[in-house]
Interface confidence: low
């Protein structure tokens, strides 16, 4: 066959679907690779062809669209499974072509099993709720396009294994689940099961997401530098190791970039000649507040190093702060015998 623009295997779109449930998969060509949509392509006389490679096989095969009850079908740029089977797992290719043009892309589809409590190897989206922030909602994801608006599905919500009924602060409202006041105890996996009829059959869509309760913007503050502070003096003799921790607390802020850095005499450590190393560690609270520690280390400090200015800086979307460390050279202890002798007038 003639040359075809091959976009390869698009592993960025690792599609996972549950076994024995409907799945609708759009050809990624129009969403991510081409500068026109399916309608434009179709009206220009281009044809969309689907084929697949089974798991652990190298052979590309056409997709069988003549299965009983139209189990697999194509509608415009969507490949439909009604429903999926475990052995539908494989790499699927959609190819757009006519006599002069050809473009194709492959993507992996994994059909996964779930247990009675919705546990599975499915990668779960994470939805963050602010702690004690008033009513917040999550919506049953990725159910658009499965049934027409005239169909009224039934939706059942679960937290972990348990149907959400008579929960104190969590109320199912159709496709939405409302949290009256989110608390740490609301952390967990939430599943909506959408049941709808189609051509005399009943289908189920299972969607699970992880809820993580995080710090509220109402409580957010600019970065707080716990160390260095005014109470600790780093007193060293030349030749000793100088270790100064910079410990900074950051309130959780959605999409904020938290930064900590040191300056020595106003310059970044990379821009000066002294042999300095910086080690960083990060820890998080249950509400994803962050504590960053950067330890500045000079293995063998010189008397010049002990005269420099060491400043810890921190920045978040809430503001920027800085704090200088108190560094000084240790005064040598008096040589006791000599001073004693001098005190008695000895020469």
């Amino acid at each position: 066959s003639e040359r075809c623009d091959d976009w390869g295997l698009d592993t960025m779109r690792q599609i996972q679907v549950f076994e024995d449930e409907p799945a609708r998969i759009k050809c990624p060509l129009f969403e991510h690779f081409l500068k026109f949509n399916y309608s434009t392509a179709h009206s220009a006389g281009l044809t969309l062809i689907w084929y697949w490679t089974r798991q652990d096989r190298d052979l590309e095969e056409p997709i069988n669209f003549r299965l009983p009850e139209n189990r697999i079908s194509k509608e415009k740029d969507v490949l439909w499974f009604r429903p999926t089977l475990l052995n539908d797992t494989g790499n699927y290719t959609c190819m757009l072509r006519n006599t002069t043009y050809c473009s194709k892309v492959a993507f992996p589809l994994e059909v996964v099993q779930k247990d009675s409590c919705f546990n599975s190897p499915m990668k779960l989206p994470v939805h963050k709720l602010y702690i004690e922030y008033g009513i917040q909602r999550i919506t049953c994801p990725n159910v658009d396009g499965y049934f027409p608006s005239s169909v009224k599905p039934t939706i059942t919500w679960y937290m972990g294994c348990y149907k959400i009924q008579n929960f104190n602060n969590v109320i199912p409202e159709g496709m939405n689940l409302s949290f009256l006041i989110a608390l740490i105890s609301n952390n967990g996996n939430y599943t909506c099961v959408v049941t709808y009829p189609e051509n005399g059959r009943t289908f189920h869509l299972t969607r699970t997401l992880t809820v993580k309760v995080v710090g509220s913007p109402k409580n957010a503050v600019p970065p707080v530098i716990h160390s260095p502070n005014d109470h600790v003096v780093y007193e060293k003799e030349p030749g000793e190791e100088l270790l100064i921790p910079c410990t900074v607390y950051f309130s959780f802020l959605m999409d904020s970039r938290n930064e900590v850095w040191w300056t020595i005499d106003g310059k970044k450590p990379d821009d000066i000649t002294i042999d300095v190393t910086i080690n960083e560690s990060i820890s998080h609270s249950r509400t994803e507040d962050e504590t960053r520690t950067q330890i500045l280390s000079i293995k063998k400090v010189t008397s010049e190093d002990l005269k420099r200015s060491y400043v810890c800086h921190a920045r978040s979307a809430k503001g920027e702060v800085a704090k200088a460390a108190k560094v000084k050279q240790k005064v040598p202890a008096p040589r006791y015998t000599v001073e004693l002798a001098c005190g008695f007038g000895a020469t």
Epitope: L86, E110, S116, C117, S120, P121, L124, G160, C161
Partner: antibody
Framework: EVQLEESGGDLVQPGASLRLSCAAS?????????MCWVRQAPGKGLEWVAC????????IYYATWAKGRFTISKASSTTLYLQMNSLRAEDTAVYFC?????????????WGQGTLVTVSS | DIVMTQSPSSLSASVGDRVTITCQAS????????LSWYQQKPGQAPKLLIY???TLASGVPSRFSGSGSGTDFTLTISSLQPEDFATYYC?????????????FGGGTKVVIK
């Protein structure tokens, strides 16, 4: 040849910590593999410890007795760990790593040869 | 806690004998059939014989068979061979949220009469 190999077993004192590793060769864990640790005390039966879905970081399960002291984790598509803290004499056992492929309910079709952990003062 | 009770705990048999081992779970296994059987010889790792209560694992001789559903299961060796003298374990899989995911039976040691 497809195999799992455990390492890290040792003689330690009560209260100590130990990290066991399980390295896969000839395969890498697929996202639907259920990777587990199972132990066997000398002369006794098999006892489940913990499991993790290879394709997930949230689907982690522990035996009731192991919660809090033992941590299962996965470093890559070929390495599984078991971090054991506050070890007790009754944790003395051969620790096996085992894989259940592609589906729940299919049993553990691949086992390592085991690594011996002895907790004694 | 889930308990898997295997019986007998040991049995003496001769080559050619038909051997039956039972396994009872204190609650139904997931999907009524998520039960596996293993064979273990001294100093070796367990070997999968049967999964999904009755499906023979790859490479396992057809003299081994499994049956049962829910809480009661049976492993049968139709004609015991010299290499079959070993310890046999059942293993159930359960809903991970309400209980331990996995539990093993105490084992049945098959020895030469």
């Amino acid at each position: 040849e497809v195999q799992l190999e455990e390492s890290g077993g040792d003689l330690v004192q009560p209260g100590a910590s130990l990290r066991l590793s399980c390295a896969a060769s000839g395969i890498s864990f697929s996202s639907s593999d259920f990777m587990c640790w199972v132990r066997q005390a000398p002369g006794k039966g098999l006892e489940w410890v913990a499991c993790i879905y290879a394709g997930s970081s949230v689907s982690i399960y522990y035996a009731t007795w192991a919660k809090g002291r033992f941590t299962i984790s996965k470093a890559s598509s070929t390495t599984l760990y078991l971090q054991m803290n506050s070890l007790r004499a009754e944790d003395t056992a051969v620790y096996f790593c085992a894989r259940s492929t592609g589906s729940v309910g299919r049993g553990f079709n691949l086992w390592g040869q085991g690594t011996l952990v002895t907790v004694s003062s | 806690d889930i308990v898997m009770t295997q019986s007998p705990s040991s049995l003496s048999a001769s080559v050619g004998d038909r051997v039956t081992i039972t396994c009872q779970a204190s609650q139904s296994v997931y999907n009524s059939n998520h039960l596996s059987w293993y064979q273990q010889k001294p100093g070796q790792a367990p070997k999968l014989l049967i999964y999904s209560a009755s499906t023979l694992a790859s490479g396992v001789p057809s003299r081994f068979s499994g049956s049962g559903s829910g809480t009661d299961f049976t492993l049968t060796i139709s004609s015991l061979q010299p290499e079959d003298f070993a310890t046999y374990y059942c293993q159930g899989e359960f809903s991970c949220v309400s209980a331990d995911c996995i539990a093993f039976g105490g084992g049945t040691k098959v020895v030469i009469k």
